[in-house]
């Protein structure tokens, strides 16, 4: 907390320039007008103050907005809005998409911070949904930010903002996350034609459920190991060798570097063997042949 | 982090010359600006010079003319060449860096203009 101390005479800021950095503190709390500094906040960014410094500016906007920043000021906070809690930001009402830029460029090439967080969350929650434009932004700052929300929330990521997704956006959701992006998916891309059909929705496979997955590998659609390894367990199981065969293609042979691995290892222990000899992969562990293979869980729900 | 070490402080008779340097390490890519501050026997901690990133640099009035702030980004260090000098600049001086999100310090080196 700066001393209120008068201003000494001949240094009162007539305007926010360059001639601030060497004020020093006290001087900055003293002699530069709150008023002033809400109306030229766009030139505090060009100015190179210390933190200490704009901790001064802060604390002089803070006690000029007690209820919050209007959006304003905001757009133009720059490197001070890094000295922002969450508790400021929260008192916040950013409904502009170009006061959301302004603020993560300050942060840009950093991981996500509690304020960037907080930011996001004031600014998603205000429109209502997380529509295209929104997602574009903040995906490109933050690529991992679609996976850092809960499925809650992304049950209000409407279809047509999936266009914006690019596929490292996905890279670290899991299988909940992805359950409930890859309806949207399948609906934002459903007028494509099979093969760049296939190209958009493969990142959102990990959602997939098994009767989709026999639909693509009627196409030819060549799916390599590593999508395949993401896709969910209980929607590879119900496939017959020759579904699979035909949704891998060529990289089918990729199998047998996986057997030990989810899903391949428990997708195999659910084949015959016969069938999977016809693979000539040396594929081991299937059922062997002359076993009967009851599915419990059908007669459990038939009785 | 950044990690700030200046060096060639010293004893200077009036009117002579020093140079002082500041070498950074750590994340020097966060870096925004640096600057040299100094602090007289006293007085208050007050900013001498600024250089930013892209080379623009800021005097004080009591050293305009005199000192001149530079950095070498091949070497990541900054230096603070004081010519003229006087017995008023006798002081620690303290090196500065501003990077995201806060500024880092250097332990200072001090200077004595004496005859």
């Known amino acids: 907390e700066v001393e209120k101390t008068a201003c000494p005479s001949g240094k009162k800021a007539r305007e926010i320039d360059e001639s601030l950095i060497f004020y020093k503190k006290w001087e900055l709390e003293a002699c530069v007008d709150a008023a002033l500094l809400a109306t030229q906040m766009d030139r505090v960014n060009a100015i190179p103050f210390t933190y200490e410094q704009l901790d001064v500016l802060k604390h002089k906007l803070d006690e000029l907005y007690p209820q919050g920043y209007p959006e304003s000021v905001i757009q133009h906070l720059g490197y001070l809005f890094l000295k922002m809690s969450p508790e400021d930001i929260r008192k916040w009402n950013v409904t502009s998409l170009e006061t959301l830029k302004a603020l993560l460029e300050v942060n840009k090439g950093h991981e996500m911070s509690p304020q960037v967080a907080t930011l996001i969350d004031r600014f998603v929650k205000g429109r209502g949904q997380l529509d295209k434009d929104t997602l574009d932004t903040l995906t490109a700052f933050y690529p991992g930010y679609l996976c850092s929300l809960s499925p809650e929330e992304l049950s209000s990521v409407p279809p047509s903002s999936i266009w914006a997704v690019r596929p490292q956006d996905l890279d670290t959701c899991d299988p909940r996350q992805l359950d409930v992006l890859y309806p949207k998916a399948r609906l934002a891309f459903q007028n494509m034609n099979g093969s760049e059909y296939f190209v958009k929705i493969q990142s959102f496979l990990g959602g997939a459920p098994t009767e989709d997955l026999k639909a693509l590998s009627q196409q030819n659609v060549s799916m390599d190991l590593a999508t395949f390894m993401k896709l969910r367990t209980d929607a590879v199981l119900p496939l017959t060798v020759a579904e699979v065969q035909k949704l891998l293609g060529p990289h089918v042979e990729g199998l047998k570097a996986e057997e030990r691995h989810r899903p391949v290892r428990d997708w195999i222990l659910r084949q015959r063997q016969d069938d999977l000899d016809t693979l000539g992969l040396g594929l081991q562990g299937g059922i062997p042949n002359g076993y009967l293979v009851l599915d419990l869980s059908m007669q459990e729900a038939l009785s | 982090e950044v990690q700030l070490v200046e060096s060639g402080g010293g004893l200077i008779q009036p009117g002579g010359s020093l140079r002082l340097s500041c070498a950074a390490s750590g994340n020097i890519g966060s870096i925004r600006h640096m600057g040299w501050h100094r602090q007289a026997p006293g007085k208050e901690l007050e900013l001498v010079s600024t250089?930013?990133?892209?080379?623009?640099?800021y005097y004080a009035n009591f050293v305009k003319g005199r000192f001149t702030i530079s950095r070498d980004n091949s070497k990541n260090t900054l230096y603070l060449q004081m010519n003229s000098l006087r017995a008023e600049d006798t002081a620690v001086y303290y090196c500065?860096?501003?990077?995201?999100?806060?500024?880092?310090w250097g332990q200072g080196t001090l200077v004595t203009v004496s005859s």
């Open positions: 500065r860096a501003t990077a995201h999100p806060t500024d880092y």
């Open positions: 250089i930013t990133t892209v080379g623009t640099t």
